[in-house]
Interface confidence: low
């Protein structure tokens, strides 16, 4: 007997037939290609079924014998046509063909659903040589079938550039239902109907669906897959799943939580990021969204001064990025700030109120009623003004800045004086005679220098002229005043 030759690395080599002059008379396999794992399958189908070759795809060889008799057509023998088995079971099936020994070069391959099974190490081909023909049995085994193994398998043999194809072997893997659509988690409005969908397939069919809510069956009668469950409405959170049943048993879908949308929880951790004289930048951490996305938020601001009228300013903003700059605030003022956010259900309660203060700013208006007159006896210019209204000082006055510009015969020079906060008058020395002096005054706080007043001009004559009358801030719309003395 010929010992079995193993070719581990090549699952699909060219299979040699017996060489002339060395024909074998016994029926031991001449060449056997290995089953990779050595696993003995749980389900086996016997190799060839005796009987006539089928007349499907046959090859009529062009070679004749010495007596010039034509050779019979080549064809695979009939074998089992349909195999039904359960998932995870093993299976082995085969095709066989007898090839006259004159053909010394044949290849055999397995195909599934029109695609060659490349590198399929669970294919094994055995040759049984005889005096005139060699029986070739190609076996294919799957150790643990899965649904993806379902399909139509065929053998193809190439011989002398002819192709011979076997009848198909249909593999049908049956198992527990397999979900193609499972219910999805949802957030729903209280007492509002919604649908859940469940779909599962076999084989075997049919697949029937039962719905389960909070561990209790919803429908007593099963529904054929696919199934849509209409829930008329919920008042509290529930967990739904579906059971898919077929002849092999049942599969349970994942449990999905159906949440009831509610108003959000109030924001937490409202904090001050930055303060200026007229704005406060706040941030907050959103509360639980109530299973519905935040739409927008409302910032409520009220003056913390007990003497204020208690009115609330409301600023609306988008829910993201949990940050808002509150503008148009008064300087050096205290405010209480709260944040509330809304989803489609409604507004949350207001967050805990926090206290915030604006900083000092530069005054927003200039000193009022600026008057300028010449005191010739002391060779000074006297300046008087009224301080800006308290509300518009935007801080505590620390003084004033006086700009005086002297212009004479094309020469111009600007001087700045700082004055303490107590006075509302100042005296500056005459710098140049026969010149125009232009005076502007600005109020100063720790927050900065405010705007300068409108310019007031006074003409300073040459020595010997008489002091006449003051110059003052013009009424709105008038030209700059010039007083010639």
């Amino acid at each position: 007997a010929i010992t079995e030759a193993r070719e581990e690395a090549k699952p699909y080599p060219l299979f040699p037939g017996p060489f002339p002059g060395s024909l074998q008379t016994d029926h031991t396999p001449l060449l056997s290609l290995p089953h990779a794992s050595g696993y003995q399958p749980a389900l086996m189908f016997s190799p060839t079924q005796p009987g006539r070759p089928h007349t499907g795809n046959v090859a009529i060889p062009q070679v004749t014998s010495v007596e010039s008799k034509p050779l019979p057509p080549l064809a695979f023998k009939h074998t089992v046509g349909h195999i039904i088995l359960s998932e995870h079971k093993g299976v082995k099936f085969n095709c066989s063909i007898s090839v006259p020994n004159i053909y010394q070069d044949t290849t055999i391959s397995w195909w599934k659903d029109g695609k060659e099974l490349l590198g399929a190490h669970h294919a094994i081909t055995q040759f049984y040589p005889d005096d005139e023909v060699t029986a070739i049995i190609a076996s294919f085994s799957i150790t643990s079938v899965q649904r993806s193994d379902n399909g139509s398998y065929i053998c193809k043999m190439k011989i002398n550039n002819e192709e011979i194809v076997s009848d198909p072997i249909y593999i049908e893997v049956q198992g527990l239902p397999h979900f193609t659509k499972q219910p999805e988690s949802m957030n729903v409005t209280r007492n509002t109907a919604f649908n859940l969908t469940c779909q599962a397939v076999g084989p075997p069919e049919p697949v029937n669906i039962f719905w389960v809510q909070n561990s209790s069956r919803v429908n007593e009668q099963p529904e054929k897959s696919p199934s849509v469950l209409t829930v008329p409405g919920l008042t509290e959170m529930a967990v739904f799943s579906c059971e898919a049943h077929n002849d092999k048993g049942l599969t349970v879908s994942k449990g999905v939580q159906i949440n009831i949308k509610a108003i959000p929880s109030p924001p937490t951790e409202v904090s001050i990021r930055n303060s200026t004289a007229h704005s406060i930048l706040i941030s907050w951490v959103p509360g639980f969204d109530g299973y519905s996305p935040f739409r927008n938020c409302s910032i409520q601001v009220k003056e913390a001064d007990p003497l204020s009228n208690g009115s609330v300013m409301i600023f609306n903003t988008s829910a993201l990025p949990h940050l808002y700059q509150i503008k148009q605030l008064q300087a050096l003022a205290n405010y209480s700030i709260g944040v509330s956010c809304m989803n489609e259900i409604g507004w949350s309660a207001v967050s805990p109120w926090i206290l915030a203060s604006t900083t000092e700013g530069a005054p927003s208006v200039a000193p009022l009623n600026v008057t300028v007159f010449l005191n010739e006896s002391s060779d000074n210019v006297d300046i008087r003004w009224m301080k800006p209204p308290t509300k518009q000082q935007d801080g505590e006055l620390v003084g004033y800045r006086i700009s005086h510009v002297w212009q004479s015969a094309g020469i111009s020079k600007e001087l700045l004086e700082e004055v303490g906060q107590n006075g509302s008058r100042a005296r500056i020395s005459v710098q140049v005679h026969n010149a125009t002096c232009t005076v502007r005054i600005a109020a100063v706080t720790r927050g900065g220098v405010g705007p300068f007043s409108d310019p007031v001009k006074i003409f300073i004559p040459a020595h010997g002229w008489v002091d006449y009358a003051p110059s003052s801030t013009p009424a709105p719309g008038n030209a700059d005043p010039v007083l010639i003395i």
Epitope: G255, Q257, F288, D289, Y291, P321
Partner: antibody, heavy 120, light 107 residues
Framework: QVQLVQSGSELKKPGASVKVSCKAS????????MNWVRQAPGQGLEWMGW????????TYAQGFTGRFVFSLDTSVSTAYLQISSLKAEDTAVYYC?????????????WGQGTLVTVSS | DIQMTQSPSSLSASVGDRVTITCKAS??????VAWYQQKPGKAPKRLIY???NRHTGVPSRFSGSGSGTEFTLTISNLQPEDFATYYC?????????FGGGTKVEIK
């Protein structure tokens, strides 16, 4: 304030089991899912899965099924990680980490970690 | 699974430097990225969630940006206490996946 306090270090032999606890305080335990994260010595962070502290339903990452079990005792606000048939490669620091927001999956608070050493 | 590729794996920097760490996701993860800081022998600490939101108490020198597949953590004015390992996490899809980490060392 929110705190996750884990049980102390464990030295185990291969094949043994270990149960790591993570006790939560400072918030409503059933409002936030609990994640488990592994960090092997000198390595990065690896997400093992999480457990829904409301329903008790666990979700395991690939590679953490079979020998790893997440469980809860809501009466004492504690999550557990049990590892059976310990192997040397299970040597790591195991962290519990709280889900930040009901609807999101990031973590906002972490336990201090439990070192599990598997050695013969 | 979604892979998070973090770079660089380590970097040296000085106090006061601006440091940038990036994470690339193998799929679109929208803005579902968080950043964590871990010091030796300690548990990770939260920094940023949803790509750009600072957790409460995290200094403003830490900022996050990005969406889709590219994300950045920036430390604008590196302080001595910032030398640590930083991890990104995608939380768009299960399984959640971390980046490999970036170790920030003193130059």
């Amino acid at each position: 304030q929110v705190q996750l306090v884990q049980s102390g270090s464990e030295l185990k032999k291969p094949g043994a089991s270990v149960k790591v606890s993570c006790k939560a305080s400072g918030y409503t335990f059933t409002n936030h899912g609990m994640n488990w994260v592994r960090q092997a010595p000198g390595q990065g962070l690896e997400w093992m899965g999480w457990i829904n502290t409301y329903t008790g339903e666990p979700t395991y990452a690939q590679g953490f099924t079979g020998r790893f079990v997440f469980s809860l005792d809501t009466s004492v606000s504690t999550a557990y990680l049990q590892i059976s048939s310990l192997k040397a490669e299970d040597t790591a620091v195991y962290y519990c980490a709280r889900k930040g927001v009901t609807a999101a999956r990031y973590f906002d608070y972490w336990g201090q970690g439990t070192l599990v050493t598997v050695s013969s | 699974d979604i892979q998070m590729t973090q770079s660089p794996s380590s970097l040296s920097a000085s106090v006061g430097d601006r440091v940038t760490i990036t994470c690339k996701a193998s799929q679109n993860v929208r803005t579902a990225v968080a950043w964590y800081q871990q010091k030796p022998g300690k548990a990770p600490k939260r920094l940023i969630y949803l790509a750009s939101n600072r957790h409460t108490g995290v200094p403003s020198r830490f900022s996050g940006s990005g969406s889709g597949t590219e994300f950045t953590l920036t430390i604008s004015n590196l302080q001595p206490e910032d030398f640590a390992t930083y991890y990104c996490l995608q939380h768009w899809n299960y399984p959640l996946t971390f980046g490999g980490g970036t170790k920030v060392e003193i130059k």
